[in-house]
């Protein structure tokens, strides 16, 4: 798995380089996670025909994956920094159970799946430091998450492959929207 941001050999070799600002660190972290998702998607697409699945079939699912909407204040029109930051953190916290589900779903990219999960936890911590209104952030209920995970793991082989594909696609879209929004902050 690639080395997480801030831990590569270049950082060691160049000690007098300016330390990254909070925003730069967050930006770099998101791009690192997106690279990890690309690698996981590559394995998923090589293994099955899931990536050719129709948008209709993907839309017709029983998952409740976080998605950016106008009211979240993350789009250019109606942009609201505080509302948007709360949405990003809440969304990432909601994605955590799905990232846990992705573990033991990959053969050659097993470490990559773990790296995506761990890097997301770090990203959440970075963003929580940035947020002023932490009270507005709702943390998912662990019991609900546990039963959701059990239900997802009970699915048949095809459904699990589809679920994996959809989680990766949705997480990628969520992170890309987050990255655009955070660059405006």
């Amino acid at each position: 798995a690639p080395v997480p941001p801030g831990e590569d050999s270049k950082d060691v070799a160049a000690p007098h380089r300016q330390p990254l600002t909070s925003s730069e660190r967050i930006d770099k972290q998101i791009r690192y996670i997106l690279d990890g998702i690309s690698a996981l998607r590559k394995e998923t697409c090589n293994k099955s025909n899931m990536c050719e699945s129709s948008k209709e079939a993907l839309a017709e699912n029983n998952l409740n994956l976080p998605k950016m909407a106008e009211k979240d204040g993350c789009f250019q029109s109606g942009f609201n920094e505080e509302t948007c930051l709360v949405k990003i953190i809440t969304g990432l916290l909601e994605f955590e159970v799905y990232l846990e589900y992705l573990q033991n779903r990959f053969e050659s990219s097993e470490e990559q799946a773990r790296a995506v999960q761990m890097s997301t936890k770090v990203l959440i911590q970075f963003l929580q430091k940035k947020a002023k209104n932490l009270d507005a952030i709702t943390t998912p209920d662990p019991t609900t998450n546990a039963s959701l995970l059990t239900k997802l793991q009970a699915q048949n082989q095809w459904l699990q492959d589809m679920t994996t594909h959809l989680i990766l696609r949705s997480f990628k879209e969520f992170l890309q929207s987050s990255l655009r929004a955070l660059r405006q902050m």
Epitope: S54, L58, N61, L159, M162
Partner: antibody, heavy 121, light 111 residues
């Protein structure tokens, strides 16, 4: 042509053990989850166990009625799946089928001919 | 667990007529555009034979007179026209999630 064939059934005393084997052909075995299903006049058709892939750490799932007594395993190099049955009870009597489940609406499921397991004193 | 309730328990149909067997699931077996409901035919001394998978897809070598329909929780198997060879037990099965479950069966006979 997809084929699954069971073996290893027979007569066993209550509390005894037995190992069923299933060999598959006609498809890339290592790419598919595999299952055991059983049938008895008393309980009808009943799913018993499932084993997943290497990428899933060979995760297993069992029917409540066999949990802790039965163990499903696989050997991808031999295209085989096994069912180790311990502490057998009279109610475990039945025909045991090895099945390769379907995949979405692309591929259908395949069942073997079955092997009879009789648990009796 | 998803419970499957099959009806009727037995059915007698005249040759050439239509036989309809129903199967109701205790919760939806539908996801990503597919309903994971299968139908099997079983004759004495033989293993179950797959007739229909994913609610409406015909198994290989299955005659066109067998058809499946339904979505979500309510499904049916239709046999038309009924032939002598169709005398058998019929089972529905959900393969959406473990534990995979079966209906109690329907005994189909000729009237």
């Amino acid at each position: 042509e997809v084929k699954v064939e069971e073996s290893g059934g027979g007569l066993v005393q209550p509390g005894g053990s037995m190992k069923l084997s299933c060999v598959a052909s006609g498809f890339t075995f290592s790419n598919y989850w595999m299952n055991w299903v059983r049938q008895s006049p008393e309980k009808g058709l009943e799913w018993v166990a499932e084993i997943r892939l290497k990428s899933n750490n060979y995760a297993t799932h069992y029917a409540e009625s066999v949990k802790g007594r039965f163990t499903i395993s696989r050997d991808d190099s031999k295209s085989s799946v096994y069912l180790q049955m311990n502490n057998l009870r009279a109610e475990d009597t039945g025909i045991y089928y090895c099945t390769r489940p379907g995949y979405g609406n692309y591929e259908e499921a395949y069942w073997g001919q079955g092997t009879l397991v009789t648990v009796s004193a | 667990d998803i419970v499957l309730t099959q009806s009727p328990a037995s059915l007698a149909v005249s040759l050439g007529q239509r036989a309809t067997i129903s199967c109701r699931a205790s919760e939806s077996v539908h996801n990503f555009g597919i309903s994971f409901m299968n139908w099997f035919q079983q004759k004495p001394g033989q293993p179950p034979k797959l007739l229909i998978y994913a609610a409406s897809n015909q198994g290989s070598g299955v005659p066109a007179r067998f058809s499946g329909s339904g979505s979500g929780t309510d499904f049916s198997l239709n046999i038309h026209p009924m032939e002598e060879d169709d005398t058998a037990m019929y089972f529905c099965q959900q393969s959406k999630e473990v534990p995979y479950t079966f209906g109690g069966g329907t005994k189909l006979e000729i009237k």
